[in-house]
């Protein structure tokens, strides 16, 4: 065993090349200089090393850089990245978007691993905020990335980043996340005129308060039913029948098919049946004629 730790004569690696795939693990350990490996990391990816051999190469880099790898090495890790643990990655200082892209490419097509999550966290923290280019990159690899962030993390997203968000990126966001993102979107798109603005803001409306929905109803936006169904129930309830009619435009007819689902069901219960009848859709369940509507929340506040 002791003899095996010395590199056999003539086997000392002069460069990282294909001949190394025939080396046993102990030979790689003994014959490959860590500094040489670090400077020629870009070649490793092109060589079909076994997972066991990659373990050896990783071990050599760990010994050379006990405090964490420099970015020049990280950028060229390639498949060796899959061997890294979150603990390894926490030692890194990744500042280049190109480095991030290179490592995400290695994991492409797979679920977000703990390693990738740690890498992204380190990168975003290093930048101070989730800027547009970073968000563009992350959502390209992981469409659900934005919705994996907590509301607190989302609060640090600058409005300019919102321009990079596609409707599908918000599919898995819950109302708490949209509550944070919607004001950012409002800021981001404020220089747009009515119709252009609506196209952009539409995906974020699950975070819109009643006041904004009322304002939108004055803009002839013709909101589709799919968007309407994603609105916050508490934001929809105070809308009048006339406001909902204006908001949906020709899509108002779709209310009939959704009358048993929230928020339509709850909204119907709050409207006078007379008002609902004016839509001519046969919506039932409104407040009957002659009934007095008491706002219990107001009553509680007074008592």
């Amino acid at each position: 065993e002791v003899e095996k730790t010395a590199c056999p004569s003539g086997k000392k690696a002069r460069e990282i090349d294909e001949s190394l795939i025939f080396y046993k693990k102990w030979e790689l350990e003994a014959c490959v200089d860590a500094a040489l490996l670090a400077t020629q990391m870009d070649r490793v990816n092109a060589i079909p090393f076994t997972y066991e051999q990659l373990d050896v190469l990783k071990h050599k880099l760990d010994e050379l850089y006990p405090q964490g790898y420099p970015e020049s090495v990280i950028q060229h890790l390639g498949y060796l990245f899959l061997k890294m643990s979150p603990e390894d990655i926490r030692k890194w200082n990744v500042t280049s978007l190109e480095t991030l892209k290179a490592l995400l490419e290695v994991n492409k097509g797979h679920e977000m691993s703990p390693q990738v999550a740690t890498l992204i966290d380190r990168f975003v923290k290093g930048r101070g905020q989730l800027d547009k280019d970073t968000l563009d990159t992350l959502t390209a690899f992981y469409p659900g990335y934005l919705c994996s962030l907590s509301p607190e993390e989302l609060s640090s997203v600058p409005p300019s980043s919102i321009w990079a968000v596609r409707p599908q990126d918000l599919d898995t966001c819950d109302p708490r996340q949209l509550d944070v993102l919607y004001p950012k979107a409002r800021l981001a798109f404020q220089n747009m005129n009515g119709s252009e603005y609506f196209v952009k803001i539409q995906s974020f409306l699950g975070g819109a308060p009643t006041e904004d929905l009322k304002a939108l109803s004055q803009q002839n936006v013709s909101m589709d039913l799919a968007t309407f169904m994603k609105l916050r129930t508490d934001a929809v309830l105070p809308l009048t029948v006339a406001e909902v009619q204006k908001l949906l435009g020709p899509h108002v007819e779709g209310l009939k098919a959704e009358e048993r689902h929230r928020p339509v069901r709850d909204w119907i219960l709050r409207q006078r049946q007379d008002d609902l009848d004016t839509l001519g859709l046969g919506l039932q369940g409104g407040i009957p004629n002659g009934y007095l509507v008491l706002d219990l929340s107001m009553q509680e506040a007074l008592s």
């Epitope: 609060s155 944070v180 993102l181 798109f189 220089n191 803001i201």
Partner: antibody, heavy 122, light 106 residues
């Protein structure tokens, strides 16, 4: 007439923090965005950031990122702006302003507080 | 970073028209607002979204915005209009205020 009433003048040492409050007299205060703007003596206006009606979403000017925190207490209709690591250049009048005008893409500052003078001096 | 440039001062006789310009790269692609500030007082919004007047603001205040320049026009200027005026626009992640213009009514 809706009014925004701000806390009184403050004198702080460099490195300290200051927390300015902004309280509305109207009952609908919690429906509106509140922005903060400052004005150094004899200088122009400088935007610091904005907080949404529920208080869950804030956006800060890049210049103040990491030093400013805006919070909201909806139960008392009060918004707070805290600025840390104060330096002499932070000596200014700090204003809160409410956006309550029309429209969905509107952020005009319609109602302003009276301003709070913060002096940073050793 | 985005900058909005205004003339430091504009002088106008009572009853005449005062025009204050605000220049910035492609400012016409953004909405411009204007604020009036009198000495020792908080600012007041006089124009928003280029040319809209908040309720309570006199009709003599009007605005326009195209190309690289937004303009605030005060027609039939009165002594009470003497103040500092600031333009404002949203760019990227921040509101930018103009350098300010002192309007003096002679």
């Amino acid at each position: 007439e809706v009014q925004l009433v701000q806390s009184g003048a403050e004198v702080k040492k460099p490195g300290a923090s200051v927390k300015v409050s902004c309280k509305a007299s109207g009952d609908t205060f919690n429906r509106y965005y509140v922005q903060w703007v400052r004005q150094a003596p004899g200088q122009g206006l400088e935007w610091m950031g904005i907080i949404n009606p529920s208080g869950v979403s804030t956006t800060y000017a890049q210049k103040f990122q990491g030093r400013v925190t805006m919070t909201r207490d909806t139960s008392t209709s009060t918004v707070y702006m805290e600025l840390s690591s104060l330096r002499s250049e932070d000596t200014a009048v700090y204003y809160c302003a409410e956006t309550r005008g029309p429209g969905f893409n509107y952020f005009g500052m319609d109602v302003w507080g009276q301003g709070t003078l913060v002096t940073v001096s050793s | 970073s985005y900058e909005l440039t205004q003339p430091p001062s504009v002088s106008v006789s009572p009853g005449q028209t005062a025009s204050i310009t605000c220049s910035g790269d492609k400012l016409g692609d953004k909405y411009a607002s204007w604020y009036q500030q009198k000495p020792g007082q908080s600012p007041v919004l006089v124009i928003y979204q280029d040319n809209r007047r908040p309720s309570g603001i006199p009709e003599r205040f009007s605005g326009s915005n195209s190309g690289n320049t937004a303009t605030l026009t005060i027609s039939g200027t009165q002594a009470m209009d003497e103040a500092d005026y600031y333009c404002q626009a949203w760019d990227s992640d921040t509101y930018v205020f103009g350098t300010g213009t002192k309007v003096t009514v002679l």
